[in-house]
């Protein structure tokens, strides 16, 4: 039949009926059956008569927002095919499962900006295939465990922002299809471990503007598909790896406007796919070496509006994919004015912004490692000088932002204008001279080259550098640094240790007129370090500053030493040959002392030559294997470090059983001759020698002579009775050894029967 006309109080467009903002207190009675989208928003409806929806078979979208409903209405027969129901900005206080049971096709339900105070597990029954549920801007204080379980098969988006939720129960959401969860602007203080387990498909989690101060280990466990995590405007003071455990697919992490003061080096090990990390508006004061090293996929790092004053060399090591680094509004002037190597590792960086960092000068190597940089923003810094070469290696630089009216237009700046023009980089450079007076207010591009002169040196110039030194623990030391300047501008002095300013430095500053040139002032600063400890070790540098800029000295290293002292000293030992000698020696000191051994004052000794010497560094033990008599002597252990050396001695006594050096041989002599028997014995202790003839001790006559050590027996005027078996007995504490010699005595010399001569 013919299409039914539009309802009297409404306007029509296609299959949409707009009855919004008409001040209606009840449904229009003539709703056409062809209606697919019905707008009843901005009226005064406090209840809905289900009968009014009896003949609306095509109805899919119902807008009832901004009315005065106090409960989820029934739409009668239409309930079963309504797909989207908008009930925001009413006065609904609770949601009952019974009210929703009839909505068999409902996919979008907006209940935001109502007066709902709690969500119980009876609120959302199984049945309605809700994909998007908006509960934002209510007064929800508690979420009952399993409150949304009835929607587990369908829910994709859940908005709970702007409520009063203070706590999330562990495993609060069993919604395996959910991709977006919005918990902005609640009152959550703590995220417990496993809170979000059950959200296997979650991609975006919004937790900004809560009061979260702690993320317990495993807080986000189970969110293995999550790409974006918003934690802005909370009270976090740190990020540790445990709290990020399980975020293996995370691409964006927003942590701005917290109170994070430190980045832990191992804090990022579980989110190595991170592409963007936002840490702006926190309390960071330093970036330590390799503190972000695990973020090899990071593309954007935003660190603006912190108080970063120290960037360690190698702080960005590992960030090989980083393209954008935002360091605006920090205090990293020192990094740009002096340090080199702060940006090493940023091989892919194309944009670096350093707006508003109180940078007064740009050092030659400030940007070393950033050869691929395309965009560099140094605006908002009262730059006075830029050293030659500072930007030169950036062959791809397309945009350089400088805005300063503080330039010291002297000979050292002369290179800059033509270089900027030649590289076509002057478009974003507003650079005006402040000095000398004759050029004040002129653009550096309009100053003729011959006007960039160095008639004086306004910026301080270091003339005495602090010197590397070594000190013993407990001693007082001092570093001296002097600078000269032709300016009468007040001079300030600072000392840095390992690139960080020493806040309570004990320094002595003085000034005098330079002898050679009456107009030049020489400024000296002395840093006193009293009773130094190991904690004083490091690299010290002075920074001398006046209105025209800062000058940085070389870095002088302080090494604090302690003389070696023995913890184990070698003891005198007495051992037998062929056994193992063991000498102990250990010492402490700073630096760790080296231990060296000597024998009798030399380093070339038998055990060393014959590879029988073994030093066990970890055991502090020195071994000599298969000990020989030659190994006996005085062994010295020397412990040496750069502070000095100490020695300790031990005597090695080698005991040896007696033995003959030269064999004792049988002898034949004639009567009247002299015979000598030698018992040349060795052993330690030296053996006592006793002579026997036969089985009895030798009876000595005036013809028998013994050397004092009994080693040589001489018998003169041999007689026949001297013949026999002579025994040399060698004895010491280790044992006794015997050697024999048969002495044969022939008659006096004369002719034998066979014609041979006797003798």
């Amino acid at each position: 039949g013919p299409r039914a006309p539009c309802a009297a109080a409404c306007t029509c467009a296609g299959d949409s009926l707009d009855c919004g903002g008409r001040g209606l207190a009840a449904l229009p009675g003539d709703l056409p059956s062809w209606t697919r989208s019905l707008n009843l928003s901005y009226n005064k409806l406090s209840e809905i008569d289900p009968a009014g929806f009896e003949d609306l078979p095509n109805l899919q979208e119902v807008y009832l927002n901004n009315n005065e409903l106090t409960a989820v209405p029934s739409l009668g027969a239409a309930s079963s095919h309504v797909v989207s129901l908008f009930l925001q900005h009413n006065k609904i206080r609770s949601v009952e499962g019974s009210q929703l049971k009839a909505y068999l096709s409902l996919e979008v339900l907006d209940l935001s900006l109502n007066n709902i105070t709690e969500v119980r597990n009876t609120c959302f029954p199984h049945g309605p295939p809700i994909k998007e549920l908006n509960l934002a801007g209510n007064r929800i204080g508690t979420l009952e465990l399993g409150a949304f379980d009835g929607l587990s098969r369908s829910l994709l988006t859940l908005r709970l922002s702007k409520n009063r939720i203070t706590q999330l129960p562990v495993r609060a959401f069993k919604l395996p299809r959910l991709t977006q969860l919005d918990l902005n602007r609640n009152r959550i203080r703590l995220i417990e471990g496993l809170t979000f387990q059950g959200l296997n498909s979650l991609e975006v989690l919004k937790l900004q503007r809560n009061n979260i101060s702690k993320l317990t280990d495993g807080a986000f466990w189970g969110l293995s598909k999550m790409h974006v995590l918003h934690l802005e405007y909370n009270s976090l003071v740190e990020v540790n790896s445990g709290s990020l455990y399980g975020l293996t697919a995370l691409h964006q992490l927003h942590l701005s406007n917290n109170s994070i003061a430190r980045i832990h080096r191992k804090g990022w090990s579980f989110c190595q796919k991170l592409h963007e990390l936002v840490l702006s508006f926190n309390n960071l004061t330093r970036l330590d070496e390799e503190s972000l090293a695990e973020l090899s996929s990071l593309s954007v790092l935003r660190l603006s509006h912190n108080s970063i004053s120290h960037i360690a060399e190698g702080a960005f090591k590992g960030l090989r994919s980083l393209r954008v680094l935002d360091l605006d509004h920090n205090e990293i002037s020192g990094t740009i004015e002096d340090t080199s190597g702060a940006f090493s590792g940023l091989d892919s960086l194309s944009k670096l912004t350093l707006f508003g960092n109180k940078i007064k000068s740009v050092a030659k190597r400030a940007f070393s490692g950033l050869e691929g940089l395309e965009h560099l923003n140094l605006g908002g810094n009262a730059i006075r000088s830029v050293q030659f070469d500072a930007f030169v290696k950036m062959k791809n630089l397309k945009e350089l932002h400088i805005s300063s009216d503080s330039f010291l237009c002297d000979c050292q700046l002369k290179w800059l204008p033509p270089w900027l023009i030649g590289r076509m980089l002057q478009a974003f450079v507003t650079a005006t001279c402040a000095h000398p007076e004759s050029l004040k207010g002129q653009s550096i591009f309009s100053v003729p080259p011959e006007s960039f002169v160095c008639d004086d040196f306004l910026k301080p110039q270091i003339i005495t550098q602090p010197e590397t030194t070594m000190a013993m623990v407990g001693k007082d030391i001092r570093f001296t640094c002097s600078a000269a300047s032709s300016s009468s501008s007040p001079m300030t002095f600072a000392w840095k240790k390992d690139n960080e300013v020493l806040t309570n430095a004990d320094m002595e500053n003085f000034v005098h007129v330079h002898a050679q040139d009456g107009e030049v002032m020489e400024y000296t600063t002395i840093l006193h370090l009293r009773q130094v400890t190991f904690g004083h070790e490091g690299r010290y540098q002075c920074v001398i500053t006046n209105h025209f800029g800062s000058t940085y000295s070389h870095k002088a290293r302080l090494t604090v030493n302690v003389l070696p002292s023995f913890t184990k000293t070698p003891h005198d030992i007495t051992i037998r040959t062929t056994t193992v000698a063991r000498l102990e020696c250990a010492a402490t000191g700073h630096p760790n002392p080296q231990i060296a051994w000597q024998k009798d004052g030399g380093t070339d000794f038998p055990a060393a030559r014959e590879r029988r010497m073994h030093v066990m560094p970890d055991d502090d033990v020195f071994f000599i294997t298969d000990v020989k008599i030659d190994d006996a002597g005085v062994y010295s252990c020397t412990a040496q470090n750069s502070a000095g050396s100490i020695s300790a001695n031990a005597t090695l006594t080698v005991l040896e059983t007696p033995s003959l050096v030269v064999p004792l041989e049988d002898r034949v002599v004639s009567v009247g001759e002299t015979v000598a028997l030698q018992c040349k014995a060795t052993g330690n202790p030296p053996p006592r020698i006793t002579w026997f003839k036969g089985d009895r001790p030798l009876s000595l006559t005036e013809r028998h002579h013994l050397t004092p050590d009994n080693q040589l027996l001489v018998v003169q005027n041999v007689v026949a009775e001297d013949a026999g078996r002579y025994t040399c007995e060698m004895s010491n504490t280790l044992g006794t050894e015997r050697a024999h010699s048969q002495l044969s005595v022939l008659p006096a010399a004369g002719c034998r029967k066979d014609g041979t001569t006797v003798g």
């Epitope: 050292q412 290179w415 033509p418 011959e450």
Partner: antibody
Amino acid sequence: EVQLLESGGGLVQPGGSLRLSCAASGFTFSNYYMSWVRQAPGKGLEWVSGISPGDSSTYYADSVKGRFTISRDNSKNTLYLQMNSLRAEDTAVYYCAKGLYSNPNEPFDYWGQGTLVTVSS
Amino acid sequence: QSVLTQPPSASGTPGQRVTISCTGSSSNIGSNYVSWYQQLPGTAPKLLIYDDSQRPSGVPDRFSGSKSGTSASLAISGLRSEDEADYYCGTWDYSLNGYVFGGGTKLTVLR
């Protein structure tokens, strides 16, 4: 009056070494960039190396990189050029030159009289 | 082959005006000031012009320098016999990170 006096030139065999010195006077040596420039017999000028005053940053021509080392001793007002692994093509008069100011891109406003280095076997 | 290109020779009669050109690129002349050096036979070079067009004290105003884009030129007016010398242009090259000279121009004053 600015004066630059080179010394240390002479005959050396290929592969050998030589150290040139340049004694400066008449100006505050420690404030200026200094360079070595050479001129082969009958040829044009070739910049060899330069050194900055403050941090002693060094710069080298590709032809000498890795073989020559420039240094300065501000306390002695002296510039040096250590030349190793010398080649026949290093034969030239070596001039010591003072930069107009402290930056490497400044012109050379004073030159020494030069010292001859001959590399030949 | 020099980075800066100069004509190998130039000549003129006394009183004439002679111009010597020097051509480079954006990494040298295009980004830097140009200098000119005069080397009289058997002597060390001498700075003649710096900062494109500035004369050190003692250099006659017959010598003048100019620059446009990546080219520079030295003009000598009122040519004199004592001007017979080799002339070199020079500047810093940011690509090579070093100072570069032209190949030199031998100026002959014809009698």
